[in-house]
Amino acid sequence: MAVTACQGLGFVVSLIGIAGIIAATCMDQWSTQDLYNNPVTAVFNYQGLWRSCVRESSGFTECRGYFTLLGLPAMLQAVRALMIVGIVLGAIGLLVSIFALKCIRIGSMEDSAKANMTLTSGIMFIVSGLCAIAGVSVFANMLVTNFWMSTANMYTGMGGMVQTVQTRYTFGAALFVGWVAGGLTLIGGVMMCIACRGLAPEETNYKAVSYHASGHSVAYKPGGFKASTGFGSNTKNKKIYDGGARTEDEVQSYPSKHDYV
């Protein structure tokens, strides 16, 4: 029960995290115009990974995409790559984790397979979260560097009455969304990895006893095959109960401790 809860919670937390990473990547507010020198600006500028926008007091907003690829800073390209890798890994992780969920029955999938899938998705979520955190942090570092550089050059163009104030940019909402989302994805991944340990099936050997209807000879087969999942996958192995010859399919009427409900 605890394993199912941990796995389910990990999945939900990762899902929220990945949705957040996607939202952050698409958001235009990665950097926003610093209003320290002009808190009453009538024109406000903010920038995302894909476009730059200007919002006027009038309510009019104009956005322009970065239509060049080679002309963009390498750091911006790196951030884009990290965020996309994070999204792709997260999406694959989500897909894998859906099939790995203990509460979902898929064919005759064994516990070991579910455990492996849970671990795989967990690792994917962890890497996805780290990619997002790294991407956002690289962008934040770029902003901080540029902020202090532009502060140093703030009034270099001042001559007489005319001031040419350089526009500075500060952290936008997308950075905080990205950090939180990356953190959630990371936590979700860790939870999935923890759940994986609980999902790994115990290597209990069940002795299969084979009876003949006549009752003359008794053959004992040392065990080695695990209890069936209830989907009739093991028809070759015959177990005979109470002197009646019935296949394993017919016997499995009640769920065993390894069944997925």
Partner: antibody, heavy 118, light 113 residues
Framework: EVQLVESGGGLVQPGGSLRLSCAAS????????MAWVRQAPGKGLEWVAF????????YYVDTVTGRFTISRDNAKNSLYLQMNSLRAEDTAVYYC???????????WGQGTLVTVSS | DIVMTQSPDSLAVSLGERATINCKSS????????????LTWYQQKPGQPPKLLIY???TRESGVPDRFSGSGSGTDFTLTISSLQAEDVAVYYC?????????FGGGTKVEIK
Amino acid sequence: EVQLVESGGGLVQPGGSLRLSCAASGFTFSDYGMAWVRQAPGKGLEWVAFINNLAYSIYYVDTVTGRFTISRDNAKNSLYLQMNSLRAEDTAVYYCARFTTGNVMDYWGQGTLVTVSS
Amino acid sequence: DIVMTQSPDSLAVSLGERATINCKSSQSLLQGGNQKNYLTWYQQKPGQPPKLLIYWSSTRESGVPDRFSGSGSGTDFTLTISSLQAEDVAVYYCQNSYSYPLTFGGGTKVEIK
């Protein structure tokens, strides 16, 4: 046709109060920011106050901050300017104007004269 | 506050001649994000409210004759009337549309010589 009609102007003593109104028609009032601009007799234009379409962004010129209050009622298609502690230098024709793309005032009312004198 | 300085204060031009009005701002009105200059020009005829002529430094408002043109960037701007008509007699104001308070220039009175 866009129309802006100001009212409420008149003669008032220094320290007194006055409330100007602007009735808007011919456009979706709630989609636009609005502004008040004044012009002292024989002088140039002076922007007084701005209010955005949903009334959460409001700005005033320093000389009227704390004395004047701009407000709007989108249900009534009306803009208001509450003027308190009036001074002689507030004497002017007050224009109500529609604020639009480019942070410009594209339509103006005919104005209402406010005279502050003892 | 951004100070807007217009020159000359008044201007007398013959009909059909070119009229040029200058406007200088104390700070750059160029918004880097969209590369637009937030400088607006208004025309005010006697006894009338102002009329919007040009915004974003050079974009003509619809219905404004093409003899009116705006130019300039950063802190220096110009309004040009290529061929002055009798109906162009008015006071012209430039306005900072970039930052509050939205300051106006002192105005330039255009008359016929």
